[in-house]
Amino acid sequence: MMTGTIETTGNISAEKGGSIILQCHLSSTTAQVTQVNWEQQDQLLAICNADLGWHISPSFKDRVAPGPGLGLTLQSLTVNDTGEYFCIYHTYPDGTYTGRIFLEVLESSVAEHGARFQIP
């Protein structure tokens, strides 16, 4: 039985040109995390494998940094980065857990007047 839950930063906003940390946390389970995939819609950004380390998709290697921890740092943000991001936790013996984050990248002037989304 899958008892775990994924906690995420929820809906977040960031300034164009800036950076943001995408974080998920798996709780309420003793399952072993074997791999975490980070995806934007259906596009793979990165994989963190417990034994093999990180794979950053070549398309994003110049502006995606691994970590902190199992999280992912997006740099040099553009308005096109606005959208849904998913953390997909592969665990043993539970199976797969998925968390969702919505990122809105704002023009600098808008971001200066406060984020539209609050982190829960």
């Epitope: 994989i47 380390g53 070549p58």
Partner: antibody, heavy 119, light 107 residues
């Protein structure tokens, strides 16, 4: 066109070391991880390790961990695999292989380097 | 280590007929499986990754299926140039391991 060109065949004595090179071209070297895989005569494929050419960080197969070192030279877009304390069972073709876009598989392979260990 | 087994060890198929190769894995690897083709005297060539995604430039007579622990590579209509050894490989943990290979010949 992606190309991985490896160094020539080597003959080594037991106990010696060998260093095989793999020169990459046709893509941005630092954007793709590099793997090393070997194949003994008439045998299957055996993974040795991988490296991130950007950071230099590497991961090894525990079987080879004490004897293998994978490095890169970013300026020349070249990856290297050094295997020490050679024994006859290390006689094999050694391949470098570029990691794919979507995970830890290999999408392009070098032509292979034959290493013969014989006294 | 994750253990990969392939069946059959070898098979001979008539030109134009279907060839099916199976790969069984000792533990759940989700869909993290690749297939490679190796012709005599050549380097391996990637055919399929993520169990079913065809690599660039690979003819569509090749297809992959399966998830978890059981996977299949199918050649729908065998051509002379498909004579080779085919290897499965998981791409899920350290060490990455390959199956022992399946030799495909023309009957």
């Amino acid at each position: 066109e992606v190309q991985l060109v490896q160094s020539g065949a080597e003959v080594k004595k037991p106990g010696a070391s060998v260093k095989v090179s793999c020169k990459a071209s046709g893509y941005t070297f630092t954007n793709y991880y590099m793997h090393w895989v070997r194949q003994a005569p008439g045998q299957g494929l055996e993974w040795m390790g991988r490296i991130d050419p950007d950071s230099g960080g590497s991961k090894y197969n525990e079987k080879f961990k004490s004897r293998v070192t994978i490095t890169v030279d970013k300026l020349s877009s070249t990856a290297y695999m050094e295997l020490s304390s050679l024994r006859s069972e290390d006689t094999a073709v050694y391949y470098c292989a570029r990691e794919g876009h979507y995970g830890f598989y290999s999408d392009y392979w070098g032509q292979g380097t034959t290493v013969t260990v014989s006294s | 280590d994750i253990v990969m087994t392939q069946s059959p060890d070898s098979l001979a198929v008539s030109l134009g007929e279907r060839a099916t190769i199976n790969c069984r894995v000792s533990e759940n690897i989700y869909s993290y499986l690749a297939w490679y083709q190796q012709k005599p005297g050549q380097s391996p060539k990637l055919l399929v990754y993520n169990a079913k995604t065809l690599a660039e430039g690979v003819p569509d007579r090749f297809s992959g299926s399966g998830s978890g622990t059981d996977f299949t590579l199918t050649i729908s209509s065998l051509q002379a140039e498909d004579v080779a050894v085919y290897y499965c490989q998981h791409h899920y943990g350290n060490p990455l391991t390959f199956g022992p290979g399946t030799k495909v010949d023309i009957k």
